[in-house]
């Protein structure tokens, strides 16, 4: 008996071939001997089966001795043995219909788990193997689970169902809802305007939710909410904003915040959270602000940085086009009695300059 695997919702075509290459009498029946369809001369006739409105054939093939049965919009319960009767012969085809669905929504928050459930006909014993967009393979029976979804899990999951040495492939599009970056750091000189951007790693037709930026300044003992906002169909509206600093927010995606000027008291780390409508949990992005200040007080030239810097960052003071006068893995460096000229304060990581501030030292007469 020939076995054919089908996918729920799809169309399947079961073949039936006569030895003569001409249109002759045929009919398809199910295992209960109920007629599905057949022919009357060159016309198609249908029987009283449950498939009535979903069954069809290809009359253009009848003259070739081919009498296919097409079943549209397959259901699990269409799994059955179908019998084609032609030329006093019976051709049997066993159809097994499978369905594979994601547990709830195919749009899941980063860190959530994905469960894929296989619907299969009674008596079948299929195995399932799924391959994630990043090439990770998972195997299972009726259910497959992936915990702690990552951004790289976004995309098309390809799942193969195996039964009776036959296979059927399912493709499921999964969208992991997350920010493009888990964390970002902005380096600014004192007084400069600061731009914070929070691009999303996904695109959806309508995006609705609410968000908040909490800020922990390095100099402050506790964190405070800098801004709260709503998101409606990709339009951003500010609900509440602190007076100091007075942040501005863009009205369109990507989420964009502007701090009028970088000041040492603002240096620190923030956490932007976004709660999406009809989703449990929140999206998070950490943002860090490092502020640099170079000052000259009497005979002391000082360079300082505030904010979350890594211990391997180097802070240097140097006269333009000369070797560094001072270079330390600290958050403040100074030079006493600096010679006249343009001095540079540099914050660097393995030789790569992250932040630079210039200060002119005038000659003393």
């Amino acid at each position: 008996k020939k076995v054919v695997l089908g996918k729920k919702g799809d169309t399947v075509e079961l073949t039936c071939t006569a030895s003569q290459k001409k249109s002759i009498q045929f009919h398809w029946k199910n295992s209960n001997q109920i007629k599905i369809l057949g022919n009357q001369g060159s016309f198609l006739t249908k029987g009283p089966s449950k498939l009535n409105d979903r069954a069809d054939s290809r009359r253009s093939l009848w003259d070739q001795g081919n009498f296919p049965l097409i079943i549209k919009n397959l259901k699990i319960e269409d799994s059955d043995t179908y019998i084609c009767e032609v030329e006093d012969q019976k051709e049997e085809v066993q159809l097994l219909v499978f369905g594979l669905t994601a547990n709830s929504d195919t749009h899941l928050l980063q860190g959530q788990s994905l469960t894929l459930t296989l619907e299969s006909p009674p008596g079948s014993s299929p195995s399932v193997q799924c391959r994630s967009p990043r090439g990770k393979n998972i195997q299972g029976g009726k259910t497959l689970s992936v915990s702690q979804l990552e951004l790289q899990d976004s995309g098309t999951w390809t799942c193969t169902v195996l039964q009776n040495q036959k296979k059927v492939e399912f493709k499921i599009d999964i969208v992991v809802l997350a920010f493009q970056k888990a964390s970002s750091i902005v380096y600014k000189k004192e007084g400069e305007q600061v731009e914070f951007s929070f691009p999303l790693a996904f695109t959806v037709e309508k995006l609705t939710g609410s968000g908040e930026l909490w800020w922990q300044a390095e100099r402050a003992s506790s964190s405070k909410s800098w801004i709260t906002f709503d998101l409606k169909n990709k339009e951003v509206s500010v609900k509440r904003v602190t007076q100091d600093p007075k942040l501005q927010m863009g009205k369109k995606l990507p989420l964009h915040l502007t701090l009028p000027q970088a000041l040492p008291q603002y240096a620190g780390s923030g956490n932007l959270t976004l709660a999406l409508e009809a989703k449990t949990g929140k999206l998070h992005q950490e943002v860090n602000l490092v502020v640099m200040r170079a000052t000259q007080l009497q005979k002391n030239l000082t360079c300082e940085v505030w904010g979350p810097t890594s211990p391997k960052l180097m802070l240097s003071l140097k006269l333009e086009n000369k070797e560094a006068k001072v270079s330390k893995r600290e958050k403040a460096v100074w030079v006493l009695n600096p010679e006249a000229g343009m001095w540079q304060c540099l914050l660097s990581d393995s030789g790569q300059v992250l932040l630079e501030s210039n200060i002119k030292v005038l000659p003393t007469w």
């Epitope: 016309f43 198609l44 069809d56 054939s57 290809r58 009359r59 253009s60 093939l61 097409i70």
Partner: antibody
Framework: EVQLLESGGGLVQPGGSLRLSCAAS????????MSWVRQAPGKGLEWVAS???????FYADSVKSRFTISRDNSKNTLYLEMNSLRAEDTAVFYC?????????????WGQGTTVTVSS | DIQMTQSPSSLSASVGDRVTITCRAS??????IAWYQQKPGKGPKLLIH???ILHPGVPSRFSGSGSGTDYTLTISSLQPEDFATYYC?????????FGQGTKLEIK
């Protein structure tokens, strides 16, 4: 002999409506799926809509929800109701018969009727 | 939806020449391809269906072949009446799609 004769074409303004008819003869009309296919000036053929012998309908994405295909088996006539017409709907519309059902190719075609959408 | 890519878009040949037109489907169409001939101001005429079956009345110089996604129409020896535009059609499902057409002109 299979014959298909389209009518109802003409000039219509954007946003307007038109109803095309196709009178069929020479075959058992009710036993065949029928289609409308169009051809914009100087362009190729584009399948528009089909209706099978049981009355199930199928549409191209470009016309879905704007065009309606129907049939009157007692009059051996196929129809295409076209609403919210656009300039890009300007074309010769052909009525065609399928070899059998909607899973078969089209084997006979009419001579076409011209639809012009312009202000 | 299945896309059909037909090539070439135009072709110049002489009477007696052998010509080949190809169609590539965006997915496997299980041999459900038909070929049509259209002359200016006329409706198309079916030449071949199910890849290689000649429609009654079509001369045997027309032939078709292919499987999977790649299909060809061949005219073994061009006759004056064969200069026309040719289209492929996939009918694997009821949402049928045509190729862009190949205009066959006299060289």
């Amino acid at each position: 002999e299979v014959q298909l004769l389209e009518s109802g074409g003409g000039l219509v303004q954007p946003g307007g409506s038109l109803r095309l008819s196709c009178a069929a003869s020479g075959f058992s009309f009710s036993n065949y799926a029928m289609s409308w296919v169009r051809q914009a000036p100087g362009k190729g053929l584009e399948w528009v809509a089909s209706i099978n012998e049981w009355g199930s309908t199928f549409y191209a994405d470009s016309v879905k929800s704007r065009f309606t295909i129907s049939r009157d088996n007692s009059k051996n006539t196929l129809y295409l109701e076209m609403n919210s017409l656009r300039a890009e709907d300007t074309a010769v519309f052909y009525c065609s018969r399928h070899y059998g059902g909607s899973y078969d190719p089209m084997d006979y075609w009419g001579q076409g009727t011209t639809v012009t959408v312009s202000s | 939806d299945i896309q059909m890519t037909q090539s070439p878009s135009s072709l110049s040949a002489s009477v007696g020449d052998r010509v080949t037109i190809t169609c590539r489907a965006s997915q496997d169409i299980n041999k459900y391809i038909a070929w049509y001939q259209q002359k200016p101001g006329k409706g198309p005429k079916l030449l071949i269906h199910y890849t290689s079956i000649l429609h009654p009345g079509v001369p045997s110089r027309f032939s078709g072949s292919g499987s999977g996604t790649d299909y060809t129409l061949t005219i073994s020896s061009l006759q004056p009446e064969d200069f026309a535009t040719y289209y492929c059609l996939q009918y694997d499902n009821p949402l049928q799609t045509f190729g862009q057409g190949t205009k066959l002109e006299i060289k």
